[in-house]
């Protein structure tokens, strides 16, 4: 049967009975081998039944004395089997054995849960020699026990290559409950049930769990650890904790905040990073995410022109990197821009609207209805056209660029002319006779040169020929026009 000592028990006497050889209690030890600095124990547990033989490992010495009497089996004397004490208290326990003097170099080692205890443990071995035997007492002390000191302690002694092992001494350190799992902060959907877990251990067991929500007890009758609380849903933020109770008292977990997921706040600080004729690069600072990660954002763009039809263009983008290039915009136009972002709950309101403008661009279309004819009397080529639609000028017209290419007998030369924005005609001198002249015209703004019109060709004959009909831009889909006289 296990003997059990509680911390309230009186210390056992150091030597409850005489060791073989009539060891006196006032006998001073011949040798004391401290393994660590001295310690005054609050409790001392010593052998209680020194006379009873050990039931475990026993070494039977092969050597006999001078009188040839066989030596008795060597065994550790029985001691207290179970020590229960509170955390931070001190404890001392020991093993004792009587060894015939014929054995030299006997050492005792301490083991806990199958591992040898080495290093700076408070272990002291004392030797009490007598005529025939030496009483050896190995003491082990712990000044302030912790849970990690819980376990089964044994002594081992090697003698004649035989190992003698003591009965185990079970140390049970009791204290307040210790949490192995505490509730964790969560972000939850409104009115949706969720679980919280709390687990605590002793000893002593059992450990009972109370749940607390916003400082009110959820369960008046505790549950045994571990406990899972199903919270039926929340409409507003709440703080939860759990209380773990055992016979030593109670421990309270950390309080955790459970937040209710909501739609995000609108983005702030929408700003223009860069503008071109047809695009605007914007950035924004996201608002509060409503305890739920942003999924994506929506950029809303509407023309600021009061005469516009007020339609809104919507561009969807990922929530990161809080940057978006709005494309397909008109040049030299004013826009109102707002940003909204969404999480799993829904869309935020739109950010404050900001005004942004695109810059001038090069015209997007060429001049229309280009016609070319030869004025032989003045030796000029007359060119006429219609200016591109205002909407597609993408800026203020500053003029036109005329390209005329002269091809004759394997020779080709291109000339460029710039003309002002007023008017829609030009006259260029004939450069080569008996040649083909190819004319193209592009509109020009401060934003650049637009596309050239389709080429219009006219044949310039040798001197002395008559006036000829004009050549003009073909209808779409026709081959390059050429006027052959």
């Amino acid at each position: 049967a296990i003997t059990e000592a509680r911390e309230e028990a009186k210390p056992y006497p150091l030597f409850p009975g005489p060791f073989p050889g009539s060891l006196q209690t006032d006998h001073t030890p011949l040798l004391s081998l401290p393994h660590a600095s001295g310690y005054q124990p609050a409790l001392m547990f010593s052998p209680t039944q020194p006379g009873r033989p050990h039931t475990g490992n026993v070494a039977i010495p092969q050597v006999t004395s001078v009188e040839s009497k066989p030596l008795p089996p060597l065994a550790f004397k029985h001691t207290v089997g179970h020590i229960i004490l509170s955390e931070h208290k001190g404890v001392k326990f020991n093993c004792s054995i009587s060894v015939p003097n014929i054995y030299q170099d006997t050492t005792i080692s301490w083991w806990k849960d199958g591992k040898e205890l080495l290093g700076a443990h408070h272990a002291i071995t004392q030797f009490y020699p007598d005529d025939e035997v030496t009483a050896i007492i190995a003491s082990f002390s712990i000044t302030s026990v912790q849970r990690s000191d819980n376990g089964s302690y044994i002594c081992k002694m090697k003698i004649n290559n035989e190992e003698i092992v003591s009965d185990p001494i079970y140390i049970e350190v009791q204290g307040l409950p210790h949490f192995t799992k505490q509730p964790e902060s969560m972000n939850v959907t409104r009115n949706t049930a969720f679980n919280l877990t709390c687990q605590a251990v002793g000893p002593p067991e059992p450990v009972n769990i109370f749940w607390v929500q916003n400082s009110s007890r959820v369960n008046e009758q505790p549950e045994k650890s571990p406990s899972v609380l199903t919270v039926p849903g929340l409409t507003e933020m709440a703080v939860f904790s759990c209380e773990a109770h055992n016979d030593k008292g109670l421990t309270v977990s950390k309080g955790v905040q459970i937040n209710i997921k909501a739609i995000p706040s609108p983005p702030t600080e929408v700003s223009i990073r860069n503008s071109t004729a047809h695009s605007i690069l914007i950035s924004w600072v996201p608002g509060f995410d409503g305890y739920s990660p942003f999924r994506n954002c929506s950029i809303q763009v509407k023309e600021a022109d009061p005469l516009s039809n007020g339609s809104v263009m919507i561009f969807n983008t990922s929530a990161l990197p809080h940057l978006y290039q709005i494309k397909q915009l008109q040049a030299l136009a004013n826009y109102s821009i707002g940003v909204s972002c969404m999480n799993e709950i829904g869309w935020s309101a739109v950010s404050p609207w900001i005004l942004a403008s695109t810059t001038e661009g090069a015209p997007s279309v060429a001049p229309l209805n280009v016609t070319v004819f030869l004025n032989e009397s003045s030796d000029n080529v007359d060119i006429r056209w219609m200016k591109p639609p205002t909407k597609q000028q993408d800026g203020e017209l500053v003029g036109y660029r005329i390209s005329h290419v002269w091809q004759s007998a394997g020779i080709s030369k291109e000339l460029l002319e710039e003309v002002g924005q007023n008017g829609s005609r030009a006259r260029i001198s004939v450069q080569v006779h008996n040649a083909t002249c190819t004319v193209r015209i592009a509109a020009v703004t401060r934003g650049g040169v637009g596309p050239f019109s389709d080429p219009v060709k006219i044949f310039i004959p040798a001197h002395g020929w008559v006036d000829y009909a004009p050549s003009s831009t073909p209808a779409p889909g026709n081959a390059d026009p050429v006027l052959i006289i």
């Epitope: 916003n214 009110s216 007890r217 008046e220 009758q221 505790p222 039926p232 849903g233």
Partner: antibody, heavy 118, light 106 residues
């Protein structure tokens, strides 16, 4: 299935004592607290208190301290309500109700009617 | 202790009508439970923790609210809904019940 079966109606004289029972079945009796609720004729519900079925510790609402006693017979999964020194105003139906988290009474007995009349 | 006031005390409705009864608390509560009681019977758990229907409760019932104001709504009243409905708070001890709303069907 889970149920709470209460003892039958009682007719008592003022000053007498009554003890009514509530037998639980279909669940582990000691895992849930047991509550007692009073309903006077034509009136609403009034929580009287509860008993911890694990420890046997009773808790009484202020109005029901003194003459009222909750007790258990755990081996029989039964809770008891005893009213001493009965008064006319104790005439009511008394319900036992199983306690779930958040003071939610998820299972109710059918009620025991106690009539106090001289 | 928290006092719960239910209104109206008596509610009369025709089948198919939508009805709402309210429960006001003298101070803020976290959850409100609701029970249905018919004459001669024990109360039945009806709505748990503000908005969760108890087992077997028809989906035409719903509960909502927060703080000091809670309500039970029946989207289309049926004859079998005639009963007294009690609210009961969880937030602070002791648990308290409202005085009840009696629903009559015309």
């Amino acid at each position: 299935q889970i149920q709470l079966v209460q003892s039958g109606p009682e007719l008592k004289k003022p000053g007498e004592t009554v003890k009514i029972s509530c037998k639980a079945s279909g669940y582990t009796f000691t895992n849930y607290g047991m509550n007692w609720v009073k309903q006077a004729p034509g009136k609403g519900l009034k929580w009287m208190g509860w008993i911890n079925t694990n420890t046997g510790e009773p808790t009484y609402a202020e109005e029901f301290k003194g003459r009222f006693a909750f007790s258990l017979e755990t081996s029989a999964s039964t809770a008891y309500l005893q009213i001493n020194n009965l008064k006319n105003e104790d005439t009511a139906t008394y319900f036992c109700a199983r306690y779930y988290n958040y003071w939610y009474f998820d299972v109710w007995g059918a009620g025991t009617t106690v009539t106090v009349s001289s | 202790q928290i006092v719960l006031s239910q209104s109206p005390a008596i509610l009369s409705a025709s089948p198919g009508e939508k009805v709402t009864m309210t429960c006001r608390a003298s101070s803020s509560v976290s959850y409100m439970h609701w029970y249905q009681q018919k004459p001669g019977s024990s109360p039945k758990p009806w709505i748990y923790a503000t908005s969760n229907l108890a087992s077997g409760v028809p989906a035409r019932f719903s509960g909502s609210g927060s703080g000091t104001s809670y309500s039970l709504t029946i989207s289309r009243v049926e004859a079998e809904d005639a009963a007294t409905y009690y609210c009961q708070q969880w937030s602070s001890k002791p648990p308290t019940f409202g005085g009840g709303t009696k629903l009559e069907i015309k």
